[in-house]
C-alpha cells in the first residue's frame, strides 16, 4: 500500500513578510518524526501521531517546501508552493527630454524594482490615460520601454507608468502603484532663421524701431528672443500670434559705437537656437551750422558767413564748397541795404557706405540802414479830382522799419499812405512826407493837385 | 547488514579545511537521515547537523553554521562533511550516524574520523 | 535549544549494584534517547522512545519518565556496563545530548 503525506495548505499565497501555519499529515501508521525542509524560518507548533504543524514566519520569496517522514522502510515526501506577493517598492519612470522635437521620437523608460511574483506583474506606460505599451516585467529590476512619435499635441501632456500586480485568479484583486507623472515639453523650431528688419544707418544718439518675426514658431510663447545692437542688448517687446512670434525694439546708437555694426536677433526654443543678422553704419552727423560774424549788420560793415560740420562731412556755402570734407566754408561781403533780409544757405553731404546723407541750414542776415522812400513807388505830384476816393501809394524802407507820415505844408493835416480816402479840394497843396527811424529822416514832396468838381 | 565506513584521520594546519566521507551499505542511503556528531577528547557529544540524502536538505545547530557544510552523493551512497576555516577548537572525533526513525534513534554510527588542527 | 541535564555526572559502582541515572530537560519533551559509548568506541543506541530497549540489549536496562524528567536503570550490574552514559533528545532543532555520566568500577 502507498501512503500519502500531505502537505496543507496547498500552494499558498501571501503577502511578502507574512507567516503561514502549515500541516503536515501521513496516513502511513506510524509514530515517525515529520520534518519540514525549508530554508524559511520555522517553528513546530504541534505533533502527533502522524501529523506536525509549523509556523513559517516573514516570508519573502517564492519558496518550496517539503514534508518528509520515513514509512515502512522508505522515505515519503510531500510538497507545496508558497507563492509570495509584493508591491514593487519602487515603480518610476526615467527623466524625459527637458524639449522634444515634434515629429521625432523619443524613448519612455519606466524602471520597476521589487514585485512578486513576476509573472503576474504588468507595466504600462500612459500618456494621460492612454495606454501606450503593456509589457510584462521580467528582469530586477524590470525596465520597460515604449517609443513615442512626439506630436504637439503631447505638449505639456503627463506620462507615467503604472504596474499592475494581478492576483485575482487567486482571489486577492488587482494591486496598482503609478509613478509621479512626468510632464513632456514638445516644439517645433523652423530651420529658416528669422525675418530681421532694421535700418542700413543709425546715426548717433537717435532711434529708430527694429523688427524681427519668425513664422511656424510652436509653443511660440515659450520662445526666447535675444536682440542686440552689437553688445548693447535691446529691451525688446514681444508678442505672439499663433505660431509667429514678433520681437519689436528700439535701437538708440551711442557715439561709441560709431561705425560697422551689426543688429542680431536670437530666438530660442527647445534649446536650440535660430539667429538673423543685419549689417548697420552708425554714423555721426553734426551740422551743418552757419554762422554770422554779426548777425545784425552796420550797412558798409564786413561779415564774414561761414559753415561747418562734422568731421568727413562736405561743406557747401551758397554754391562755394569748401576746400576738403571737414572743413569750413566761408565766405566774405560788405553789408548793403540790399544784404538786409539776405539767406545764407550752406547743404552738407556725408557719404556712409556709398550712400550720400544730405542736409541744409541758412542763416539769414539783418542790415542796419536809414529811413528812404523810393520815388518809383511814390508819385511826387498827383492829379485828382474832388470828391473821388484815391490811395496815396508810399512806401518807406528801411531797417529798422521807418514811421511813414504825410503832413500838409502849413498845416498838422495828415494824408493817411496806403490806406484809401475821400478827396476834396481841402487837399490840394504840397506835402511832406517823411520816413522816420532811430537812423534818421529821409523827406520827400508830394504835391497834390485837386481838380474842383464842375457841376456843368 | 547497516554500516558506515568513514574516512581516515585528518591532520591540518589552521585556517585549512577538511572534507571526510562516511560511505553507507547494507541499506537504502537515501531513505534515511543522515547525523553527524562531535566529540572533542574527554568531552561529551555535540549535535552538528544532519542531510536528507533523499532531498538533500540540511539542518544545522547554530553553532556549526558557518563551520560544517553537509553534503551527499546518492550514486556512491556517501555523506561527506567539509569543515573550514579550522582551528584548534575543531581538533576532535567526528561521527556520522543514521537516525533509523523514532523508533530506533541514531542507530548505526560510523567508527569516527579524527581532526586533529596543528600548526 | 533544549538543555539535557544529566546526574550525577560521574558515579562508581560495584558488579552486581542497581544504578539509576537521570536526566532533566529544560522544557518538555515527548521521549528521549539512551547511548552508551565505551572508550575509543561510537556511541551505541541503548534505549529508545524512552523505554523501548534496542535490538540486542540486556534486559537489566530499563528506561522511565515523561515530561522533563527521565531515568536510565540498570537493575544489576555487570562488567561490561562500565562506560559513559548519554540522553539525547529531538523535540526541536538542534539535537542535544546530555554531558554524560561516567559509570565507573568501585
Known amino acids: 500500500q502507498e501512503f500519502l503525506l500531505r502537505v496543507e495548505p496547498q500552494n499558498p499565497v501571501l503577502s511578502a513578510g507574512g507567516s503561514l501555519f502549515v500541516n503536515c499529515s501521513t496516513d502511513c501508521p506510524s509514530s515517525e518524526k515529520i520534518a519540514l525542509e525549508t530554508s524559511l524560518s520555522k517553528e513546530l507548533v504541534a505533533s502527533g501521531m502522524g501529523w506536525a504543524a509549523f509556523n513559517l514566519s516573514n516570508v519573502t520569496g517564492n519558496s518550496r517546501i517539503l514534508c518528509s517522514v520515513y514509512c515502512n522502510g522508505s522515505q515519503i515526501t510531500g510538497s507545496s508552493n508558497i507563492t509570495v506577493y509584493g508591491l514593487p517598492e519602487r515603480v518610476e519612470l526615467a527623466p524625459l527630454p527637458p524639449w522634444q522635437p515634434v515629429g521625432q521620437n523619443f524613448t519612455l523608460r519606466c524602471q520597476v524594482e521589487g514585485g512578486s511574483p513576476r509573472t503576474s506583474l504588468t507595466v504600462v506606460l500612459l500618456r494621460w490615460e492612454e495606454e501606450l505599451s503593456r509589457q510584462p516585467a521580467v528582469e530586477e529590476p524590470a525596465e520597460v520601454t515604449a517609443t513615442v512619435l512626439a506630436s504637439r499635441d503631447d505638449h505639456g501632456a503627463p506620462f507615467s507608468c503604472r504596474t499592475e500586480l494581478d492576483m485575482q485568479p487567486q482571489g486577492l484583486g488587482l494591486f496598482v502603484n503609478t509613478s509621479a507623472p512626468r510632464q513632456l515639453r514638445t516644439f517645433v523650431l523652423p530651420v529658416t532663421p528669422p525675418r530681421l528688419v532694421a535700418p542700413r544707418f543709425l546715426e548717433v544718439e537717435t532711434s529708430w524701431p527694429v523688427d524681427c518675426t519668425l513664422d511656424g514658431l510652436f509653443p511660440a510663447s515659450e520662445a526666447q528672443v535675444y536682440l542686440a545692437l552689437g553688445d548693447q542688448m535691446l529691451n525688446a517687446t514681444v508678442m505672439n500670434h499663433g505660431d509667429t512670434l514678433t520681437a519689436t525694439a528700439t535701437a538708440t546708437a551711442r557715439a561709441d559705437q560709431e561705425g560697422a555694426r551689426e543688429i542680431v536677433c536670437n530666438v530660442t526654443l527647445g534649446g536650440e537656437r535660430r539667429e538673423a543678422r543685419e549689417n548697420l553704419t552708425v554714423f555721426s552727423f553734426l551740422g551743418p551750422i552757419v554762422n554770422l560774424s554779426e548777425p545784425t549788420a552796420h550797412e558798409g560793415s564786413t561779415v564774414t558767413v561761414s559753415c561747418m560740420a562734422g568731421a568727413r562731412v562736405q561743406v557747401t556755402l551758397d554754391g562755394v564748397p569748401a576746400a576738403a570734407p571737414g572743413q569750413t566754408a566761408q565766405l566774405q561781403l560788405n553789408a548793403t541795404e540790399s544784404d538786409d533780409g539776405r539767406s545764407f544757405f550752406c547743404s552738407a553731404t556725408l557719404e556712409v557706405d556709398g550712400e550720400f546723407l544730405h542736409r541744409n541750414s541758412s542763416v539769414q542776415l539783418r542790415v542796419l540802414y536809414g529811413p528812404k522812400i523810393d520815388r518809383a513807388t511814390c508819385p511826387q505830384h498827383l492829379k485828382w479830382k474832388d470828391k473821388t476816393r484815391h490811395v496815396l501809394q508810399c512806401q518807406a524802407r528801411g531797417n529798422p522799419y521807418p514811421e511813414l507820415r504825410c503832413l500838409k505844408e502849413g498845416s498838422s493835416r495828415e494824408v493817411p499812405v496806403g490806406i484809401p480816402f475821400f478827396v476834396n479840394v481841402t487837399h490840394n497843396g504840397t506835402y511832406q512826407c517823411q520816413a522816420s527811424s532811430s537812423r534818421g529822416k529821409y523827406t520827400l514832396v508830394v504835391v497834390m493837385d485837386i481838380e474842383a468838381f464842375s457841376s456843368h | 547488514q547497516v554500516q558506515l565506513q568513514q574516512s581516515g584521520a585528518e591532520l591540518a594546519k589552521p585556517g585549512a579545511s577538511v572534507k571526510m566521507s562516511c560511505k553507507a551499505s547494507?541499506?537504502?542511503?537515501?531513505?534515511?537521515?543522515m547525523h553527524w556528531v562531535k566529540q572533542r577528547p574527554g568531552q561529551g557529544l555535540e549535535w552538528i547537523g544532519y542531510?536528507?540524502?533523499?532531498?538533500?536538505?540540511?539542518e544545522y545547530n547554530q553553532r556549526f553554521q558557518d563551520k560544517a557544510t553537509l553534503t551527499a552523493d546518492k550514486s556512491s551512497s556517501t555523506a561527506y562533511m567539509q569543515l573550514s576555516s579550522l582551528t584548534s577548537e575543531d581538533s576532535a572525533v567526528y561521527y556520522c550516524?543514521?537516525?533509523?526513525?523514532?523508533?530506533?534513534?541514531?542507530?548505526?554510527w560510523g567508527q569516527g574520523t579524527s581532526v586533529t588542527v596543528s600548526s | 535549544d533544549i538543555q539535557m541535564t544529566q546526574s550525577p555526572s560521574s558515579l562508581s559502582a560495584s558488579v552486581g549494584d542497581r544504578v539509576t541515572i537521570t536526566c532533566s530537560a529544560s522544557?518538555?519533551?515527548?521521549?528521549i534517547y539512551w547511548y552508551q559509548q565505551k572508550p575509543g568506541k561510537a556511541p551505541k543506541l541503548l534505549i529508545y522512545?524512552?523505554?523501548n530497549l534496542a535490538s540486542g540489549v540486556p534486559s537489566r536496562f530499563s528506561g522511565s519518565g515523561s515530561g522533563t524528567d527521565f531515568t536510565l536503570t540498570i537493575s544489576s550490574l555487570q562488567p561490561e556496563d562500565f562506560a559513559t552514559y548519554y540522553c539525547q533528545q529531538w523535540k526541536s532543532i538542534p539535537l542535544t545530548f546530555g554531558q554524560g555520566t561516567k559509570l565507573e568500577i568501585k
Open positions: 542531510i536528507n540524502p533523499n532531498t538533500d536538505y540540511t
Open positions: 550516524a543514521r537516525w533509523g526513525g523514532n523508533s530506533y534513534g541514531l542507530d548505526y
Open positions: 522544557s518538555s519533551v515527548s521521549y
Open positions: 547494507g541499506y537504502t542511503f537515501t531513505v534515511y537521515w
Open positions: 522512545l524512552t523505554s
